[in-house]
């Protein structure tokens, strides 16, 4: 004989568990329906009536199948140094991330506690390591034969153009200037950019200790304070 399909609420067989999207109600001692995401339990089940679900009110949500008496409150509005990357709906909480050009300097539990602007490397310095969601840009001096003439959190040092005849030699912050005859090889116009970090939520991971050339921070200096650092600037 085919097994009968039990409709909630029903008493489970001894030693068995309730089915998917059902829960065992201790008071009624029955398997009862859970409420779907976006809803909550308005009335709990009894031996004769199933769970009564109701939609979450504005600014509240449930993300999972549940039997909670009240929906969870969405988080506060995003701080002014953050942007809302996921709105508060009946089925999901609001998510705030650091605004473009910023990174999360301090993560706590679900989100970012403190956003900070990405360091900008000043002329003569280029990006050695791009910023990520949780780490700042690292600047480095442009090596001989390369330059950066911008104040930027994305531009790297790029090679000087090679001239048939040099009018003004290049330095760390300026490209070479050729005489009116065209250069043998010229770099493409415009600065070379590193991609900005994609703004999605991520776990706070500890970056590999690497000395920074920035004036605002460096990390793990067992011999004491660093010599004066250069190469970056504020906004």
């Amino acid at each position: 004989l085919p097994a009968q399909v039990a409709f909630t609420p029903y008493a489970p067989e001894p030693g068995s568990t309730c089915r998917l999207r059902e829960y065992y109600d201790q008071t009624a001692q029955m398997c009862c329906s859970k409420c779907s995401p976006g809803q909550h339990a308005k009335v709990f089940c009894t031996k004769t009536s199933d769970t009564v679900c109701d939609s979450c009110e504005d600014s509240t949500y449930t993300q999972l199948w549940n039997w909670v008496p009240e929906c969870l409150s969405c988080g506060s509005r995003c701080s002014s140094d953050q942007v809302e990357t996921q709105a508060c709906t009946r089925e999901q909480n609001r998510i705030c991330t650091c605004r473009p050009g910023w990174y999360c300097a301090l993560s706590k539990q679900e989100g970012c506690r403190l956003c900070a602007p990405l360091r900008k490397c000043r002329p003569g310095f280029g990006v050695a390591r791009p910023g990520t969601e949780t780490s700042d840009v690292v600047c480095k001096p442009c090596a001989p034969g390369t330059f950066s003439n911008t104040t930027s959190s994305t531009d790297i040092c790029r090679p000087h153009q090679i001239c048939n005849v040099v009018a003004i030699p290049g330095n760390a912050s300026m490209d070479a200037v050729c005489t009116s005859t065209s250069p043998t090889r010229s770099m493409a116009p415009g600065a070379v950019h590193l991609p900005q970090p994609v703004s999605t939520r991520s776990q706070h991971t500890q970056p590999t200790p690497e000395p920074s050339t920035a004036p605002s921070t460096s990390f793990l200096l067992p011999m004491g304070p660093s010599p004066p650092a250069e190469g970056s600037t504020g906004d």
Epitope: R113, P207, T217
Partner: antibody, heavy 116, light 112 residues
Framework: QVQLVQSGAEVKKPGASVTVSCKAS????????IIWVRQAPGQGLEWMGW????????NSAQKLQDRVTMTTDTSTSTAYMELRSLRSDDTAVYYC?????????WGQGTLVTVSS | DIVMTQTPLSSPVTLGQPASISCRSS???????????LSWLQQRPGQPPRLLIY???SRFSGVPDRFSGSGAGTDFTLKISRVEAEDVGVYYC?????????FGRGTKLEIK
């Protein structure tokens, strides 16, 4: 008990650099940030910057950004603040304090005098 | 930057009487995590600052219960129910909701 002990007073000439140290004890150094605050004679408190002792992430006041370097040495539970190109208006008592959500323990302060 | 405006800048009070200091921020101090990172510091003459109140109304350990903090959003108050001689000094409100952290200009509490 939690303590932050700072280095001693300094007298510097304009254009020089100064490094103030802040040795922490009584807690796990890497689980808190350190802020640096200064107070010019007879003036209020001025926030200079914050550094994470966990990963070195930091942020400093925009007006000081080109002149200040904050570092941490987790092996000795010490934070450092270096201020370069000193000017007479940098004369102040410099404080370190623990925290980011709130600043619960403070160093005793380090007087830096900039005078020619 | 968030500007913290304290009033009054000076407050002469009688011993045993209450005192109240107001602090207003130029924008809401409510963080997206739901917390409001507003603290009150006391600085006695010749001493470093000392934490009194954090997250608007939580009293730090060892702080007498005559100190209380209240407020929300952009308006905050520090109250001393009965001023004692040892309360003389400058009181600062400070926000650490976002960078740059900022302080009020301070309120000098003195005895009449």
């Amino acid at each position: 008990q939690v303590q932050l002990v700072q280095s001693g007073a300094e007298v510097k000439k304009p254009g020089a650099s100064v490094t103030v140290s802040c040795k922490a004890s009584g807690y796990t150094f890497s689980t808190y940030g350190i802020i640096w605050v200064r107070q010019a004679p007879g003036q209020g408190l001025e926030w200079m910057g914050w550094i994470s002792a966990f990963n070195g992430n930091a942020n400093s006041a925009q007006k000081l950004q080109d002149r200040v370097t904050m570092t941490t040495d987790t092996s000795t539970s010490t934070a450092y603040m270096e201020l370069r190109s000193l000017r007479s208006d940098d004369t102040a008592v410099y404080y370190c304090a623990r925290g980011e959500d709130f600043f619960d323990y403070w160093g005793q302060g380090t007087l830096v005098t900039v005078s020619s | 930057d968030i500007v913290m405006t304290q009033t009054p800048l000076s407050s002469p009070v009688t011993l045993g009487q209450p005192a109240s200091i107001s602090c207003r921020s130029s924008q809401s101090l409510v963080h997206s995590d739901g917390n409001t990172y507003l603290s009150w510091l006391q600085q006695r003459p010749g001493q470093p600052p000392r934490l009194l109140i954090y997250k608007v109304s939580s009293r730090f350990s060892g702080v007498p219960d005559r100190f209380s903090g209240s407020g929300a959003g952009t308006d905050f108050t520090l109250k001393i129910s009965r001023v004692e001689a040892e309360d003389v000094g400058v009181y600062y409100c400070t926000q650490s909701t976002q960078f740059p952290f900022t302080f009020g200009r301070g309120t000098k509490l003195e005895i009449k």
